[in-house]
Interface confidence: low
């Protein structure tokens, strides 16, 4: 679709006569009839295929033809044409004379023609115009013509048909040969995909507005870069949605198990090592003078009973010291003056001779100890109590109290975490080092077996288009985790639908 | 000059299938999307649905179920199925280039009847 | 989908009076909205795309304008030729939709 423009610019009739040689009367009152037709070598009568014009009377005998145009008037003359513009035409202008005010063709004596020029040729499609002139022996006639394309029209041809549009169809306006220019933001063959943010991942983003960056699920971030770790992943991380990768030091399926409680927590006191014995539990090696399950307890250095052979200990600012009784001496008390011959043991002790009787040793019934079976026997000296368990004397015998987790006489049993049958659902409980395991039966799932799933959401393979399945443990639902250029729940639609109609 | 001219039965039977085809002129089907567009008796203008200039297509989400659009673009033809006919079913259905819907067939009035 | 709610259902006007039709969208759609005539027994024809540009071989009298969410066709100096029904529609996003219509007497 294009237009034919036609501009008279200048008609030179200076006898004011008709093509006849006959004079006009009082002057040529001169007006035009345009004719645009295709090529013919010789331009011959016929139907004006690519349409006529006509013009009012412009002026008398000799005259210019005002350009018109801006006041929305007749010159230039427009020839409109509804197909592709072929680039070859014929003219025929002929110039008239009007007696009076009826300017039809049947209201005009015969001999009104004042002159008629035709011409043929090739014409591109353009914005500039080609001037001409034609002579006869009576008349010239000066114009200059062009063809250009209507509006929403381009091409060499004006056969390629584009509107601008910025819509759901498309974001673009259009070139002068009818391609498509994007508008900012926006690229594809319709201009229909927006750019999404600088840096947006990739294939765990995308956008539906330009310079934006939406998540796919599992995903998340200004530029959808980090991925969400399991729902409830408390001391965890993940590389690929929906993990829970355990930091150092945690464990379990949402990594709350806390492995290093010596770290997290700090129980030892008083400069003790700590020592790291299993979920929740640890061991506390204190330092000398200290004692208690977490070291808190300040020793007197005479609790250790450190002076021998019945010597008494008196404690003092920088350690203690021993008071030796008789026959006795050294830091300890634990030389002896005595021999066999002065019965030094005590509470039925057997003494026996050594070093040719220069000293003796004391051989004591059950439940004494000592040099000289003076003392009696303590019998939390050998710490028989297991897994960090604190020895307590209680009259003629002994008890241990247990860390948490542990029991038996010596603390030697772990308390079975399975004790409470904490798996529903019929799961099978398994006692580990550092907690239990429940092994769930076909239906269910979750720590202890308490969620009900019919299948792995994932088995029936609910995602398009070569989707990632993930199946979230905590809905028990899949989630699809799309290719570039799909989306939707299952990744069944192609980004962009291309456009209807892009103008 | 664009043109678009709808062809098919005028009369259906209830709970059959109705078949259009829309053929287009002057202009290329696979650069430009065509819509379906319906006119009950006496009633509005209701959108059907589009074959875009891709193939891809949209449909009206109350008769995206019977509803299926496609299309032969070496013959600049565009293809309108629509199962299980009701009488109210009954309309012109004209055919119009998608976009600002410049350009539309005459239309073909489809009776829905036993 | 979006909705185009449009009033009056129908009115009844005098020759060279001005009438106006309004088209209210649910959504935000831009100026993707379309004004159609549409005469007994023919196809709609376009009057106004883009919210307020003048179709091709289209009287100046008619005119389209937008407001926020809602988009009015206004005819200046009704003519006989005027009568008909008048459709908005929204081409933004699909489902593509349509008002409701308003039959224009004259």
């Known amino acids: 679709s294009g237009v034919f423009q036609l501009q008279l610019q200048e008609f030179i009739n200076e006898r004011g006569v008709l093509a006849s040689g006959r004079p006009c009367e009082p002057g040529c009152r001169t007006f035009f009839r345009v004719c645009l037709k295709h090529f013919q070598a010789v331009v011959s009568p016929g139907p004006c295929t690519f349409g006529t014009v006509s013009t009012p009377v412009l002026g008398t005998n000799s005259f210019a033809v005002r350009d018109d145009s801006s006041g929305g008037g007749r010159n230039p003359l427009q020839l409109p044409f509804n197909f592709t513009w072929p680039g070859t035409f014929s003219l025929i202008i002929e110039a008239w004379h009007a007696p009076g005010d009826d300017l039809r063709p049947e209201a005009l004596p015969p001999d009104a023609l004042i002159s008629k020029i035709a011409i043929q040729g090739s014409l591109a499609v353009g914005q500039n115009w080609l001037l001409d002139e034609q002579t006869s022996t009576l008349t010239r006639l000066r114009y200059s013509y062009r063809v250009i394309c209507s509006d929403n029209y381009y091409g060499d041809n004006c056969s390629r048909l584009c509107k601008k549009r910025n819509d759901h169809f498309g974001h673009y306006v259009c070139q002068p040969d009818g391609n498509l220019s994007c508008l900012p933001g926006w690229t594809g063959e319709y201009c229909q995909q927006p750019i999404c943010l600088s840096g947006c991942h990739e294939q765990n983003g995308y956008c539906s507005k330009p310079a934006e960056c939406l998540c796919r699920p599992g995903w998340q971030g200004r530029l959808c870069n980090e991925c969400i770790p399991h729902n409830g992943c408390r001391h965890g991380t993940c590389s690929t949605p929906w993990q829970c990768t355990c930091d150092e030091g945690w464990g379990g399926l949402f990594c709350d198990q806390d492995l290093n409680y010596c770290t997290h927590h700090s129980p030892c006191k008083n400069g003790a090592t700590c020592s790291n014995s299993g979920q929740r539990s640890y061991t506390c090696t204190c330092r000398p003078g200290y004692t208690g399950v977490d070291c808190e307890l300040e020793l007197s250095e005479c609790d250790s009973n450190p002076c021998r052979n019945g010597g008494s200990c008196k404690d003092q600012e920088d350690g203690y010291h021993c008071l030796c009784p008789p026959g006795y001496y050294g830091l300890h008390c634990e030389h002896s003056t005595l021999s066999c011959a002065d019965s030094p043991c005590f509470n039925g002790g057997s003494c026996r001779e050594r070093n040719q009787g220069a000293n003796y040793a004391c051989e004591c019934p059950p439940n004494f100890t000592g040099s000289n079976c003076e003392k009696k026997v303590d019998r939390c000296t050998s710490n028989p109590c297991a897994n960090g368990g604190q020895c307590l004397n209680r009259g003629p015998s002994r008890m241990c109290r247990c860390r948490p987790g542990f029991t038996g006489t010596y603390c030697e049993l772990h308390v079975s975490d399975c004790a409470r049958n904490p798996c529903a659902h019929g799961g099978t409980c398994h006692d580990l080092e550092n907690g239990l395991m429940c092994t769930c039966p076909a239906g269910f799932s979750g720590r202890r077996c308490e969620v009900r799933t019919s299948i792995d959401a994932c088995a029936s393979s609910p995602c398009f288009n070569r989707a990632t399945c993930y199946t979230d443990l905590s809905t028990d639902t899949f989630v699809c985790n799309c290719p570039y250029g799909f989306v939707g729940s299952r990744c069944e639609f192609p980004v962009g639908l291309p456009p209807s109609f892009p103008w | 000059q664009v043109q678009l001219k709808e062809s098919g039965p005028g009369l259906v039977q209830p709970s059959q299938t109705l078949s259009l085809t829309c053929t287009v002129s002057?202009?290329?089907?696979?650069?430009?999307?065509v819509s379906w567009v319906r006119q009950p008796p006496g009633k509005g203008l209701e959108w059907m649905g589009g074959?875009?200039?891709?193939?891809?297509?949209d449909y009206n989400s109350a008769l995206k179920s019977r509803l299926s659009l496609s299309r032969d673009t070496s013959k600049s033809q565009v293809f309108l199925k629509m199962n299980s006919l009701q009488t109210e079913d009954t309309a012109i259905y004209f055919c119009?280039?998608?976009?600002?819907?410049?350009?539309w067939g005459h239309g073909v009035l489809v009776t829905v009847s036993s | 989908d979006i909705q185009l709610t449009q009033s009056p259902a129908s009115l009844s006007a005098s020759l060279d009076e001005i009438v106006t039709i309004t088209c209210q969208a649910s959504?935000?759609?831009?100026?993707?909205l379309a004004w159609y005539q549409q005469k007994t027994g023919k196809s709609p024809q376009l009057l106004i795309y883009?919210?307020?540009s003048l179709a091709g071989g289209v009287p100046s009298r008619f005119s389209g304008s937008r407001s926020g969410t809602q988009y009015s066709l206004k005819i200046s100096k009704l003519q006989v030729e005027d009568t008909g029904i008048y459709y908005c529609?929204?081409?933004?996003?699909?489902?593509?939709?349509f008002g409701s219509g308003t039959k224009l007497e004259i």
């Open positions: 119009t280039l998608s976009g600002d819907f410049d350009y």
């Open positions: 002057g202009i290329s089907i696979s650069i430009y999307g």
């Open positions: 074959i875009w200039g891709d193939g891809s297509t």
């Open positions: 959504l935000d759609i831009g100026n993707w």
């Open positions: 883009g919210a307020t």
């Open positions: 529609l929204q081409h933004y996003r699909a489902p593509f939709t």
